[in-house]
């Protein structure tokens, strides 16, 4: 089949000196392009033909998936979390076998009181979400549990969660030192054995926007970078305007290649432009240089 695509051409010269013609839509000069055989061959860089158009893979776009996008969507999670595996020993309750059964009346009651006690302990920590008992065992009651922390994603989320885990350690150490049995009795909601408090493990959500950006940029990974705007990360190439790393091509168009971003300088009716940033203009008639 024959496709008629009306275009006019603007001459662009790359900063290396070669001239490239890029199409811009115009009704004045009709050009016919013959598309023969398998449509899949039209789609470059791993793109595929869906019957109507090329479906391109990141980071490509264009009619034949031949162009590289200026920015790639990266989506950090709304919230990030940490899980602390802790063990405390509760002395104000005597262990019974029923506590091993998570559906028993005894476990449910213990869970309610323990949760209430921990909510009091951690009440001043904004990242605190709650506790989850994983196991109860003899001794009086050794409580293996997770402390769950959550915060909104910001570039500094790791620091925020690290600080919160430190406060958790301080608070649980304090309460298990202060709320202890006196004369075989507890006057608090729960009492603890000071020596039974241990932090076993801390797991923090791992999200690295730079890593996601590099992965999605594929062979262009060295040329895409992350910049922040309003605490949100953006994965951009230097061809994306409005960022610190943006390349200014002046009288030209920024284009990504496998060697990085380069400027394709325009040639107008009166001037041609050259230089790495297309900032050197030469007047065609007078051959006069000006900057």
């Amino acid at each position: 089949p024959l496709a008629t695509i009306p275009v006019s051409t603007t001459s662009l010269t790359s900063s290396e000196g070669s001239t490239i013609s890029t199409p811009s839509v115009d009704i004045s000069t009709p050009v016919t392009t013959s598309i023969v055989g398998d449509q899949c061959s039209r789609c470059k860089n791993g793109g595929f033909w869906d019957g109507l158009k090329c479906q391109c893979l990141t980071p490509y776009y264009g009619e034949s998936c031949e162009e590289v996008v200026n920015s790639i969507d990266i989506a950090p999670p709304e919230t990030v979390s940490a899980q602390m595996e802790l063990t405390v020993t509760v002395t104000s309750v005597k262990f019974t076998d029923e506590l091993k059964n998570h559906s028993s009346q005894e476990f449910r009651e213990f869970n309610k009181t323990f949760t209430e006690q921990m909510n009091i302990v951690y009440s001043g920590i904004p990242e605190y979400v709650g506790v989850n008992i994983t196991n109860l065992r003899l001794g009086s009651v050794v409580v293996e549990h997770d402390v769950l922390l959550r915060t909104k994603y910001t570039p500094e989320y790791k620091t925020a969660l690290d600080n919160a885990t430190e406060v958790v350690k301080q608070k649980i150490t304090k309460v298990t030192t202060e709320q202890i049995m006196t004369n075989d009795n507890c006057s608090a909601l729960m009492c603890f054995n000071t020596t039974g408090t241990q932090v076993q493990n801390i797991t923090v959500t791992q999200y690295d926007p730079v890593e996601e950006c590099r992965q999605k940029a594929e062979e262009y990974e060295d040329y895409f970078l992350v910049e922040y705007r309003d605490q949100k990360p953006y994965c951009i190439s230097p061809c994306e305007s409005g960022f610190n790393a943006s390349k200014n091509c002046n009288h030209g168009k920024c284009q990504m290649s496998q060697n990085g971003a380069r400027c394709l300088c325009v040639t107008t009716e009166t001037h041609w432009y050259s230089g790495e940033d297309c900032n050197q203009g030469t007047q065609k008639s007078h051959h006069h240089h000006h900057h």
Partner: nanobody, 124 residues
Framework: DVQLQASGGGVVQPGGSLRLSCAAS????????MAWFRQAPGKEREVVAF????????YYADSVKGRFTISHDNSKNTLYLQMNSLRAEDTAVYYC?????????????????WGQGTMVTVSS
Amino acid sequence: DVQLQASGGGVVQPGGSLRLSCAASGYTSNRYSMAWFRQAPGKEREVVAFIWTDGGRTYYADSVKGRFTISHDNSKNTLYLQMNSLRAEDTAVYYCAASSLLLQTINPRAWPYWGQGTMVTVSS
């Protein structure tokens, strides 16, 4: 859920005796804790005594030691408080409380189940 029904309060002269009862229902096990607390007008609720129904533990507040006896009848699921040598300062509303755990705490907040109060007045 656990239900508690307290009874046996009344007016008694100093030096007299009273026996409080608290019937429990809704337990899935025969091993749990029960307690008596009291609250005098304008004061905080305080523990009087507690017992483990398996006989493993009893506790008495210093102010009632030697005068009050806590006991539990497993066949009737009933808690008792035998109060002898009553004094004016024993005047209060007496509450029975329970837990499905074997508790060793005198803090009322640790006890999840409560009966309604029964009034004990010691007055001449």
